[in-house]
Every structure is written in structure tokens, then in C-alpha cells.
């Protein structure tokens, strides 16, 4: 599946939380970023993530005018020049510094099996989704469409009214 344009079709800032309302947070430790899944204190500020949406052509033999067969890919960047990456060998989700064009490991196919939550499928390993395991993000294999509603791969995007990427 190939990205159909080098520019995102839209971008916006949002805070990311689990289906159970735990926050996804990012902390700089020893010159690298760690990703945590945690309960925030009442007035603690949520970390923001820049979501960039790209169109991608799904590999298929479908006929039509080119409109059908598109999917949405997203990249997630919590801070400048750093993006979430799928490490398929380690089944882990990591923050890495990258330059554009971003590697395929930084792209995730967007799903929403609920109207108010989304899931992120690894572009480089179809059927594998970002999920929550032991208070960390991990890559989790989903073996059927019924399991797309499994809560540990569902995330909520809370909008923010700020437009600047910190």
C-alpha cells in the first residue's frame, strides 16, 4: 500500500488516551523518549500529539474511478522531529527521531470500530495494532475483525484548541 501524496491531507493536535481514560504521556529520559500509560492527577496537563493524516491506495483489483480503495494512514508526533514507530521485531512502540520522508514504521492505518475511538494498525505488519500492555504501549496481534473492538487497542482522541506543535 503506497502513500498517494507526500503531504498530509490534514493535521491536528490531540491528546491520546486509552479506552479506559488513562493518558498516553511522553517523557525525556537519558536523551531518549519513554512512553507511559498512566492516570493523570486532576489538573495535570495532558500531552499533545500531532496527528498527520495521509491517503494511501489499498492494493486491490477493484474497478472504479480511483476513489474506492483508499485508506487513511496516520503518523503520530508528540514533539518536534520525533514520531511513534512500530518495532515489529520487539513487538514494541518506540519514539524515534526521524527526517522526512518518514520510514514505513512510522505509518499506521487508521481504524475506528466505534464512533468515538480509533485504532492504529502497523503499516509494516498488517493485523498488528498499537495496544496497551503492562502500562506501556506495545504491538498486539489482532486475529479477526471481531477483535477490533478489544478495548486494549482502542484509543480516544481529545481535541485541543491549540494549533502549535510543542
Amino acid at each position: 500500500m503506497s502513500i498517494t501524496g507526500i503531504s498530509p491531507i490534514t493535521e491536528y493536535l490531540a491528546s491520546l488516551s486509552t479506552y479506559n481514560d488513562q493518558s498516553i504521556t511522553f517523557a525525556l529520559e537519558d536523551e531518549s523518549y519513554e512512553i507511559y500509560v498512566e492516570d493523570l492527577k486532576k489538573d495535570e496537563k495532558k500531552d499533545k500529539v500531532l496527528l498527520s493524516y495521509y491517503e494511501s491506495q489499498h492494493p486491490s483489483n477493484e474497478s472504479g474511478d480511483g476513489v474506492d480503495g483508499k485508506m487513511l494512514m496516520v503518523t503520530l508526533s508528540p514533539t518536534k522531529d520525533f514520531w511513534l514507530h512500530a518495532n515489529n521485531k520487539e513487538h514494541s512502540v518506540e519514539l524515534h527521531k526521524s527526517e522526512k520522508p518518514l520510514p514505513d514504521q512510522a505509518f499506521f492505518v487508521l481504524h475506528n470500530m466505534h464512533s468515538n475511538s480509533v485504532s492504529f494498525e502497523s503499516k509494516t505488519d498488517p493485523g498488528v495494532f498499537i495496544g496497551v500492555k503492562d502500562n506501556h504501549l506495545a504491538l498486539i496481534k489482532v486475529d479477526s475483525s471481531e477483535n477490533l473492538s478489544t478495548e486494549n487497542i482502542l484509543f480516544k482522541l481529545s481535541e485541543t484548541h491549540h494549533h502549535h506543535h510543542h
Partner: antibody
Framework: EVQLVETGGGLVQPGRSLKLSCKTS????????MYWIRQAPGKGLEWVSS????????YYPDSVKGRFTISRDNAENTIYLQMSSLRSEDTATYFC??????????????WGQGSLVTVSS | EIQMTQSPSVLSASVGDRVTLSCKAS??????LDWYQQKLGEAPKLLIY???NLQTGIPSRFSGSGSGTDCTLTINSLQPGDVATYFC????????FGGGTKLELD
């Protein structure tokens, strides 16, 4: 070529039931959200129902909740709208539509031509 | 529930005019907004998605813009074939249509 064809509309008395079908072709049906939207004569568009690709989740506005049921048959590439306890205000042309993208509920990429439902005694 | 308000409800313009249609959401919709064109007796057709992306096959005289709660559809150099009703549609939180703007020729 993507096609969506609605059938099952007609004249029905208040309080009765009716089932609409939307047969589709030309795309990977089981990967798309599907929708019903209606339009009363001379009025605007109103979203009526949505269903996820695997049929596991369905959504309705308050105006039809508890009376209308959306369902899908991924083997037959068809969605349905079961309407019960029909009221005069349900009189409308009912359109089915498919999502614009695989797997997501964003945008209505294609629409059928619609099926007219008239609720009157 | 997010409310979508379109203005004006009816707009008269001449061939060649630059026409602007407005859509206002009751809360931030994060660019999750489409524009649909419906000609008399026809099904609606997707023109613009995610606020400013032109659907395949739609003439480039159509464009969309906006962010937050305010979005705009612009038609540069209006053509006779553009006579229709235009609806905005949000999918940021549930699904809601605006009431429509009927575009007529003077």
C-alpha cells in the same frame, strides 16, 4: 464501478413496519462503514444510522433510536434498515451511502439513488 | 450533539461570479467536515472532504477552507451546472448535516 441500489420503499400506514435493503457492488464491502441518510420532501439531509465494517457497532440519532435497526450481510454485500412504529415524520427518501475510506467513519464517498418511504393512512 | 448552521439558506448569483457558502459548527470539529452537492432529483455527491480536499473528478473551481468551528465552500467562476443545494457535514463527533444552501442563478 461502485453501485448502491436501495429497494423496499413504498406506502405504509402509521405504526407499521418496513424494511429497506441496499445492495452494493464494485468495492470491498466488508471493509467499509455504511450509512442510511434520509431527506423529507423539500427538506435537508438527516443522518439516520451508521454501522461498522464488521457490523459489531451501530449508531442512531434520538429521532429514530429504538424504532430503526441497521444491519448488514457481508456475504451478500447488503445493508438493511428495519423501520418500525413508523410516523408521518418518517416520510422521506432514504439513501444508503458508503464510507470514503477503508475502516473509518469519515466522509460519505458514494450514495445510492434513494428509496421513497411514505407514511400515511 | 454538534449543530451545523449554514448561511445563507438561499443564494442568488450570476455566471462567472465567485460564490462563498458558510458553515458554522457549535464546537470545534478539527477539520472533520465535508461538502456535498445535490442537484434536483439526484443523490448528493461528495465535493470536498476533510475541509479542503477536492474529491476526485470535481472541478478545481470548487475549494474548501476553514478550521475550528468555521468552514467555507468557495466556487470560483460559477457555472450554470453548479445550480444545486450544498450541504456541509461533520464527522468529528457523531454525524450531522447543515441545513443546506440553495444556490440559484440570477
Amino acid at each position: 464501478e461502485v453501485q448502491l441500489v436501495e429497494t423496499g420503499g413504498g406506502l405504509v400506514q402509521p405504526g407499521r413496519s418496513l424494511k429497506l435493503s441496499c445492495k452494493t457492488s464494485g468495492f470491498t464491502f466488508s471493509s467499509y462503514w455504511m450509512y442510511w441518510i434520509r431527506q423529507a420532501p423539500g427538506k435537508g439531509l438527516e443522518w439516520v444510522s451508521s454501522i461498522t465494517p464488521n457490523g459489531g457497532n451501530t449508531y442512531y440519532p434520538d429521532s429514530v433510536k429504538g424504532r430503526f435497526t441497521i444491519s448488514r450481510d457481508n456475504a451478500e454485500n447488503t445493508i438493511y434498515l428495519q423501520m418500525s412504529s413508523l410516523r408521518s415524520e418518517d416520510t422521506a427518501t432514504y439513501f444508503c451511502a458508503k464510507g470514503h475510506y477503508y475502516y473509518t467513519s469519515y466522509s460519505l464517498g458514494y450514495w445510492g439513488q434513494g428509496s421513497l418511504v411514505t407514511v400515511s393512512s | 450533539e454538534i449543530q451545523m448552521t449554514q448561511s445563507p439558506s438561499v443564494l442568488s448569483a450570476s455566471v462567472g461570479d465567485r460564490v462563498t457558502l458558510s458553515c458554522k459548527a457549535s464546537q470545534n470539529i478539527n477539520k472533520h467536515l465535508d461538502w456535498y452537492q445535490q442537484k434536483l432529483g439526484e443523490a448528493p455527491k461528495l465535493l470536498i472532504y476533510f475541509t479542503n480536499n477536492l474529491q476526485t473528478g470535481i472541478p478545481s473551481r470548487f475549494s474548501g477552507s476553514g478550521s475550528g468551528t468555521d468552514c467555507t465552500l468557495t466556487i470560483n467562476s460559477l457555472q450554470p451546472g453548479d445550480v444545486a443545494t450544498y450541504f456541509c457535514f461533520q464527522y468529528n463527533n457523531g454525524w450531522t448535516f447543515g441545513g443546506g444552501t440553495k444556490l440559484e442563478l440570477d
